[in-house]
């Protein structure tokens, strides 16, 4: 080994990163030139920005399965950039129909074959963009990893790749013998590297010896409001959920400059931007009459497009609750009914790529992701206590009042490159 | 996968009633929202009703009060109980998931007619 590569800087070519295997699409879902009828950013590559647009496909997809298996009155975070990150470490070393379905699953098959061949090179690209951000008031850290059982012996080239392009090597434990300390190991290594804010990721008893391969993503996001809400303007109101009950939410208030629009059927969008401007929440909330089940079902990337693009900066009203949303899951039986069936399955799986020996038996026992979300008048996850001097609030009755009181969509995204970093639904921002 | 299939649908006067079943392939169908959707010819696909994991359910207008759906986790199955038919309710109705939809089945005829 020579010097180490800055994966940030660094170009195809400096990484010989070819996966074991190929996937050429049947039907030819993409070419090179798709995508160029919407006008890239400037400075940014053409392969990391259809990366991003792969992404929101499948985020908005993976949001709506997710969705139909929650209670309305649930709340909903996950980071979608997080979960396809994450398997696309193990697309890397995937083969025959395990690997289809995953370019399937995660939309990667809707992108340029050269974008998708060098993915994870692109994945790199991406993350480098968000993680590395120089703006230091916010900040975006993720864990992601596969931990696999001691007895197999890894591909080195995998390995070498993996600490590369996303940070951690397959890290081997040993489920046979010491199942519940492995657990205790990997929960272990989430908290330390989120700081201590995302705790206990996998659940008791979720491994067991014949565990094999287990994939781990977890992520959280801290920023400041470019225009914060006054502590003293937070009253206690009632928010009306969906069931038609009402609980009392802390709700913050602000008067202030924010590109909003009002979109079909009354639905209200909104844009607050985190300070830096890359980084921005956006919040969807329907009229009073609509249920956000039914926005949730007519939401497509093409439809969250055409709204931002819609949005125009006015003077308006905010009323907006306090929430922590802390959300962890199994992704495995959400993604088998997506379609990712044979990764998961041990007769079925083609990891050759990840194994050493060629052994053809390896398979993911299950995949477990976690992202939390806590929003106060500082911004994001903000503990800090900067003096803030806003004018109290006014009875101005005809300006524009975005009041969210009842159940709504949140979005946070990176602006440029419109990639969604995390999405949501806050249906009870009254649980602690 | 998941394997959706439709039966049930039949010829029937007006007036009339039929049950229609849906067979879902899902690991995570207790918990999962699903819905009944029916077309007819030249027209859009459209939601005729739906229920969720915890047993709530929605209709369209044209249906209420006729149409009741329901399920059976230990069976994996939606059911449409379709009372007091319209010649307006022909059409093949489908089940599949309220937001998200997979492969679409066969579906199955509906036809009132005297």
């Known amino acids: 080994h020579g010097s180490p590569v800055d994966i940030c800087t660094a170009k195809p070519r400096d990484i010989p990163m070819n996966p074991m295997c190929i996937y050429r699409s049947p039907e030819k879902k993409a070419t090179e030139d798709e995508g160029s009828e919407q006008k890239i950013p400037e400075a940014t590559n053409r392969r990391v920005w259809e990366l991003s647009k792969a992404n929101s496909r499948f985020a908005t997809t993976f949001y709506q399965h997710l969705a139909d298996s929650k209670n309305d009155n649930d709340n909903i975070f996950l980071s979608p950039l997080s979960i396809s990150t994450a398997f696309a470490m193990t697309k890397l070393g995937a083969c025959n129909d395990t690997l289809q379905q995953l370019m399937e699953v995660f939309k990667f098959d809707t992108i340029s074959e050269k974008t998708s061949d060098q993915i994870h090179f692109f994945f790199a690209k991406l993350n480098c963009r968000l993680y590395r951000k120089a703006n230091k008031s916010s900040k975006l850290v993720s864990a992601n990893r596969l931990f696999g059982d001691k007895s197999l012996t890894f591909n080195e080239t995998y390995q070498d790749i993996s600490e590369l392009v996303y940070g951690a090597k397959l890290q081997p434990l040993d489920f046979k013998e010491n199942a519940e300390q492995s657990r205790a190991a990997i929960n272990k290594w989430v908290s330390n590297k989120t700081e201590g804010r995302i705790t206990d990721v996998i659940p008791s008893e979720a491994i067991n010896e014949l565990t094999v391969l287990v994939l781990v993503n977890t992520i959280y996001f801290k920023g400041l409001w470019k225009s914060k809400f006054s502590p003293e303007n937070t009253r206690k109101e009632l928010f009306y959920k969906a069931d038609g009950e009402s609980c009392s939410a802390s709700m913050m208030y602000q008067e202030g400059k924010f590109r909003y629009r009002r979109v079909a059927e009354g639905t209200q969008v909104l844009e607050l931007p985190f300070k830096g401007d890359d980084i921005t929440m956006v919040l969807i909330l329907p009229k009073p009459e609509k249920s956000l089940a039914k926005v949730e079902k007519e939401l497509t990337p093409e439809v969250l497009q055409e709204w931002l693009d819609e949005l125009e900066e006015m003077m308006l009203v905010v009323h907006m609750p306090r929430f922590r949303i802390e959300d962890g899951f199994s992704l495995k039986e959400q993604l088998q009914d997506m379609g990712l069936v044979d990764l998961f399955s041990p007769e079925k799986s083609k990891l050759p790529g990840i194994v050493a020996e060629g052994r053809d038996d390896l398979y993911v026992s299950d995949a477990f992701h976690k992202a939390f979300l806590e929003v106060n008048e500082e911004g994001s996850e903000a503990a800090a206590s900067t003096a803030v001097v806003i004018a109290g609030r006014s009875l101005n009755p005809n300006r524009v009042t975005f009041k969210a009181n009842r159940p709504f969509l949140v979005f946070i995204r990176e602006v440029p490159l419109n990639t969604i970093i995390f999405m949501g639904r806050v249906a009870n921002p009254c649980v602690k | 996968q998941v394997q959706l299939q439709e039966s049930g649908g039949g010829l029937v006067q007006p007036g009339g009633s039929l049950r229609l079943s849906c067979a879902a392939s899902?690991?995570?169908?207790?918990?999962?929202?699903w819905a009944w959707y029916r077309q007819a010819p030249g027209k859009q696909r459209e939601l005729v009703a739906s229920?969720?994991?915890?047993?709530?359910?929605n209709y369209a207008d044209s249906v209420k009060g006729r149409f009741t759906i329901s399920r059976d986790n230990a069976k994996n199955t939606v059911y449409l109980q379709m009372n007091s038919l319209k010649p307006e309710d022909t059409a093949v109705h489908y089940c599949?998931?309220?937001?998200?939809?997979?492969?679409w089945g066969q579906g199955t005829q509906v036809t009132v007619s005297s």
């Open positions: 899902a690991l995570t169908f207790s918990s999962r929202a």
């Open positions: 599949n998931g309220y937001r998200y939809t997979y492969a």
């Open positions: 229920i969720t994991g915890g047993g709530t359910t």
